[in-house]
Amino acid sequence: NIDVCKLGTVTVQPAPVIPLGSAANISCSLNPKQGCSHYPSSNELILLKFVNDVLVENLHGKKVHDHTGHSSTFQVTNLSLGMTLFVCKLNCSNSQKKPPVPVCGVEISVGVAPEPPQNISCVQEGENGTVACSWNSGKVTYLKTNYTLQLSGPNNLTCQKQCFSDNRQNCNRLDLGINLSPDLAESRFIVRVTAINDLGNSSSLPHTFTFLDIVIPLPPWDIRINFLNASGSRGTLQWEDEGQVVLNQLRYQPLNSTSWNMVNATNAKGKYDLRDLRPFTEYEFQISSKLHLSGGSWSNWSESLRTRTPEEEPVGILDIWYMKQDIDYDRQQISLFWKSLNPSEARGKILHYQVTLQEVTKKTTLQNTTRHTSWTRVIPRTGAWTASVSAANSKGASAPTHINIVDLCGTGLLAPHQVSAKSENMDNILVTWQPPKKADSAVREYIVEWRALQPGSITKFPPHWLRIPPDNMSALISENIKPYICYEIRVHALSESQGGCSSIRGDSKHKAPVSGPHITAITEKKERLFISWTHIPFPEQRGCILHYRIYWKERDSTAQPELCEIQYRRSQNSHPISSLQPRVTYVLWMTAVTAAGESPQGNEREFCPQGKAN
């Protein structure tokens, strides 16, 4: 705390503001009749240095001049940038117990002269905005520095505004609050910034600009779109702009896209026709403006207009497949399946599907609409049938897709050869085949069909399928493929009026099964033992089971068990063995094997054959 200098004064030479690296002399003088006692020699003046209110040094040893008991001069050097406080105190040497008394204090500021301001940039936002300029001040001066922005222009006028930088605020931008209007488009303006502080001054180079150089139009507003005759592909984009705008840039994209469609429009006057939109698609539209064809700056992009284009009638054809099942000697059940159109084909919300089953010769027609992607009907087994399906939205229907209903696996000569299924990775399977050897009619296409081998999958789940051109002999299936699940895969070869198929099982990833089959019964028939079992529960199979193994050994024997390996067939749940001795008690069990290995053993059963077994 500095008292109001009642006891004396402190002065600084050359000044209280000095350049970095300079020294200063601080003189502390007592006022007349002030001091410790009537003996001036007992007055000792000391100088203390404070930085950020913390005492950092006693400058007792820096005295360069001393009028004993009356005044002292101290030299201070190596002052750091910023402000340093010096306090002069009076120490009465004959009374050591009393603390020194403050006399007076002074603040010395160390800094640098300002550098010439650089990179002046001026902007006016919109035709009715005001001119604001910013600049780079250069190095920090550590002193209060005043900046004057001067703008000179037509009519011999100069506009100026000031601000200052210190340790609390920075001044590198000023808004002059004056508007430049388009009638001054040809006029030249000159801007400069002057910086001044206690150690010097500097001025920027003059920067010349025109109205067009600095005015950034406001972004367009009130954006809307009008679809001509409710068209889904053609629309007129409309917006409001500032009066002087001559050039617009439009950008638009579907919401899930990553790249914009860009359009430049000259003299659009707030209107532009777009002709390449996708129906029933969420779009984002933005517009930017410019006041001059060659010069000037683009405005910021407008706020986005987000809207969905109207529907148009579906295009493209449905991908149809079917299943046939005989019910009795004169009736069959036809189940039709089809895949949903992708959005670019559906071009709207599909409301329903129109399904037709027609008997070609007798002209019998069954028609129906459904909202589902499958349809089942019972029809006579006689006659040649064809099916067609089309998709409808609010604007119309797609062209019907036709398919001939043939016996899919009825012609052995059309069955593809050497069908194989290899797991590619966790979620797909590569299926390959060779064409039928002796097909008497040309293969029009292959259909690869797959379904998880789980109970009830035929009735519960629709099949998955891929259409393959006749010259391709492989398919990578991935839709709904999960690891550790076995799929039945069929490859159909279809001609105009016939079908042949081959079947294989495959999985995308496998492990050894969790458990072995459960032996439910052992029966003796005609000198043979029949082992019956229940299959491993579906979740525990963990892939395609290649074969089962039946193990047996004499009870209490330590010898290796004998085994019989059976090719896995889903329909089979019993198997005969005939190498057991009569009236010997055996222990039997089963395991299951996938490509990854063998399961733990299933339950053990004991059995003692009675008859005369071979």
Partner: nanobody, 123 residues
């Protein structure tokens, strides 16, 4: 409506000083720009100096460094301190004001005007 009342004109010798004052009344709180124009006989009216409520000052190049404009935003008063006066500065000085300003409007298109006060500088 805005009324502008000037005062402080008069006769002064070359090299002397004068201070003009202008007080606005009415809807004066809306005035962003206030300033001084002058018109000498047979000449067009020209802006001498103007100031906005944000502190931006505008000077005609012929008076720069000699005249200083200042303002009290609170009571809508503007002053023009004229030093080192020259015979060429002889004119009727008008106080003017506007809600907002463009460079083009500075040429003489302000919305509100005072009646004027005569300044004569003798040689």
């Amino acid at each position: 409506q805005v009324q502008l009342q000037e005062s402080g004109g008069g006769l002064v010798q070359a090299g002397g000083s004068l201070s003009l004052s202008c007080a606005a009344s009415g809807s004066a709180f809306r005035l962003n720009f206030m300033g001084w124009y002058r018109q000498a006989p047979g000449k067009q009216r020209e802006l001498v100096a103007a100031i906005n409520s944000g502190g931006t000052e505008i000077y005609h190049d012929s008076v720069k460094g000699r005249f200083t404009i200042s303002r009290d935003n609170a009571d809508s008063t503007v002053w023009l301190q004229m030093n080192s006066l020259k015979p060429d500065d002889t004119a009727v000085y008008y106080c003017a004001a506007d809600r907002g300003i463009s460079w083009s409007k500075l040429a003489g298109g302000m919305d509100y005007w005072g009646k004027g006060t005569q300044v004569t500088v003798s040689s």
